[in-house]
């Protein structure tokens, strides 16, 4: 007996060959020998079956002998075995009905569970694996699952569910809500305008939801909010903003905030999350804010960095166009009795500068003394 | 450690008048709004008002307005409720919370202090 | 103002039971929504905020869930010290309102 495999939702089409090249009359019934459909002349003729709205055939075939029975919109019950009468034969064709569908939602945050459930009829005994865009393969029985969803995971997962060596094919697309970063970090002078940027990873017509900034300033001893705001429909209005700093917010995606200047009280970590609408829990980003000061005091020159530093990050002092005076895996470094000229605190990783800020050393004239 | 003690309650006649104060520690006071919340006895609990880090903004539930003011002193570190007008249905006890929580939760609360206006 | 409705009002179970109390708003409040526990004679304490986050020294028995207008509070398996009242609290607009309360109690 001929095995076919079927989507669920999808439409089958079941073959039936006549050895004639011509309309002759054909039955096609169910196991329970209901009469689905069949002809009477050139007439399309249906039986009492379930299928009756769902079932045809393809008159144009019927001249070359072949009387095909489609089955649209495929439900899981519909799978049975199907027998052709034509000619004093029959041909037995079963045909099995598969669903896969996701869940709850296609759209899921990052670091949560997709389950993938497969439906398949009785008595089957289906295996599926199931292909993720990032070329990850998983395997299983009726359901598939897969903890901590990451950004590459967003895309069209591919399945295929084996029946009696017959595979049949899905396209599940997953997207997963996430920001495009992780985490970032921003390098400023002490003073200079600070610009924070959180952008989606995703885009969805309408996006609405809420949000926070929550602060930790390396200085401080407890963490506290810089900012509370609503998304409706892309468009963002603050809630509540911290009387210090006094952070402005843009109106639009992506989210962006703007602290007017960078002090050192400010340096630290925050976590934006956000909520979205009909969803459990929360995308976050973590952004970090590294603040550089120079300054000469009397015979000191000294140059500071607060905030969230890596220990192999290195702090220089140098005068313009020469060797680093002083060079340390430390966040304050300090030359004494400076030679006058333009100085340079440098904050690098591996050579590469991240952060540089110049202070001018005059020069100091001795006062003669008083005879 | 956080802690907000609550002073002040008492009982008052119908009409009559009661300041509340909360003294604060343990976290800087100036930088978190401050709420009042109230709960009659067996009953549930009712947001009372609130003030902004230096108290230029203040928001009151509809049954107090214009009876109850809240102030704050950050110098003092303290958190107050001047309660004029007092109605029996204003027995109950009340607390001092600190809005630090995220998402604008309240997130610490004092131990309370009873109202009580009666006859 | 918007009117939070707890349901039910109280509810029985045994220690290790799975309790879950609604908390419905009466228009869209985002996630602008925490829980509060509440022991006898003493002041309420903060379990849940933003709707689904977890305070900090809350065991993790207690869960959140929702956004919207419909909210969750889930105890998976009740200790002897759960046997409380159970509070929602709206933070989207003032006067910030909280639900009428559920007390759990033992069968």
């Known amino acids: 007996k001929k095995v076919v495999l079927g989507k669920k939702g999808d439409t089958v089409e079941l073959t039936c060959t006549a050895s004639q090249k011509k309309s002759i009359q054909f039955h096609w019934k169910n196991s329970n020998q209901i009469k689905i459909l069949g002809n009477q002349g050139s007439f399309l003729t249906k039986g009492p079956s379930k299928l009756n709205d769902r079932a045809d055939s393809r008159r144009s075939l019927w001249d070359q002998g072949n009387f095909p029975l489609i089955i649209k919109n495929l439900k899981i019950e519909d799978s049975d075995t199907y027998i052709c009468e034509v000619e004093d034969q029959k041909e037995e064709v079963q045909l099995l009905v598969f669903g896969l569908t996701a869940n709850s939602d296609t759209h899921l945050l990052q670091g949560q569970s997709l389950t993938l459930t497969l439906e398949s009829p009785p008595g089957s005994s289906p295996s599926v694996q199931c292909r993720s865009p990032r070329g990850k393969n998983i395997q299983g029985g009726k359901t598939l699952s897969v903890s901590q969803l990451e950004l590459q995971d967003s895309g069209t997962w591919t399945c295929t569910v084996l029946q009696n060596q017959k595979k049949v094919e899905f396209k599940i697309d997953i997207v997963v809500l996430a920001f495009q970063k992780a985490s970032s970090i921003v390098y400023k002078k002490e003073g200079e305008q600070v610009e924070f940027s959180f952008p989606l990873a995703f885009t969805v017509e309408k996006l609405t939801g809420s949000g926070e900034l929550w602060w930790q300033a390396e200085r401080a001893s407890s963490s506290k909010s810089w900012i509370t705001f609503d998304l409706k429909n892309k468009e963002v209005s603050v809630k509540r903003v911290t009387q210090d700093p006094k952070l402005q917010m843009g109106k639009k995606l992506p989210l962006h905030l703007t602290l007017p200047q960078a002090l050192p009280q400010y340096a630290g970590s925050g976590n934006l999350t956000l909520a979205l609408e009909a969803k459990t829990g929360k995308l976050h980003q973590e952004v970090n804010l590294v603040v550089m000061r120079a300054t000469q005091l009397q015979k000191n020159l000294t140059c500071e960095v607060w905030g969230p530093t890596s220990p192999k990050l290195m702090l220089s002092l140098k005068l313009e166009n020469k060797e680093a005076k002083v060079s340390k895996r430390e966040k304050a470094v300090w030359v004494l009795n400076p030679e006058a000229g333009m100085w340079q605190c440098l904050l690098s990783d591996s050579g590469q500068v991240l952060l540089e800020s110049n202070i001018k050393v005059l020069p100091t004239w001795s006062t003669p003394v008083q005879p | 450690e956080v802690q907000l003690v609550e002073s002040g309650g008492g009982l008052v006649q119908p009409g009559g008048s009661l300041r509340l104060s909360c003294a604060a520690s343990?976290?800087?006071?100036?930088?978190?709004?401050m709420s009042w919340v109230r709960q009659a006895p067996g009953k549930g609990l009712e947001w009372v008002a609130n003030?902004?880090?230096?108290?230029?903004?203040?928001y009151y539930v509809d049954s107090v307005k214009g009876r109850f003011t809240i102030s704050r002193d950050n110098a003092k570190n303290s958190l107050y409720l001047q309660m004029n007008s007092l109605r029996a249905e204003d027995t109950a006890v009340h607390y001092c919370?600190?809005?630090?929580?995220?998402?604008?939760?309240?997130?610490?609360w004092g131990q309370g202090t009873l109202v009580t206006v009666s006859s | 103002d918007i009117q939070m409705t707890q349901s039910p009002s109280s509810v029985s179970g045994s220690v290790g039971d799975r309790v879950t109390i609604t908390c419905r708003a009466s228009q869209g409040i985002s996630s602008w929504l925490a829980w509060y526990q509440q022991k006898p004679g003493k002041a309420p304490k903060l379990l849940i905020y933003?709707?689904?986050s977890l305070q900090s020294g809350v065991p993790s028995r207690f869960s959140g869930s929702g956004s919207g207008t419909d909210f969750t509070l889930t105890i998976s398996s009740l200790q002897p010290e759960d046997f409380v009242t159970y509070y929602c609290?709206?933070?989207?607009?003032?006067?910030?309102?909280f639900g009428q309360g559920t007390k759990v109690e033992i069968k």
């Open positions: 609290q709206q933070a989207n607009s003032f006067p910030w309102t």
């Open positions: 003030i902004k880090e230096d108290g230029s903004d203040k």
């Open positions: 343990g976290f800087t006071f100036s930088s978190y709004w």
């Open positions: 919370v600190r809005e630090g929580g995220q998402w604008l939760a309240l997130d610490y």
């Open positions: 933003g709707a689904s």
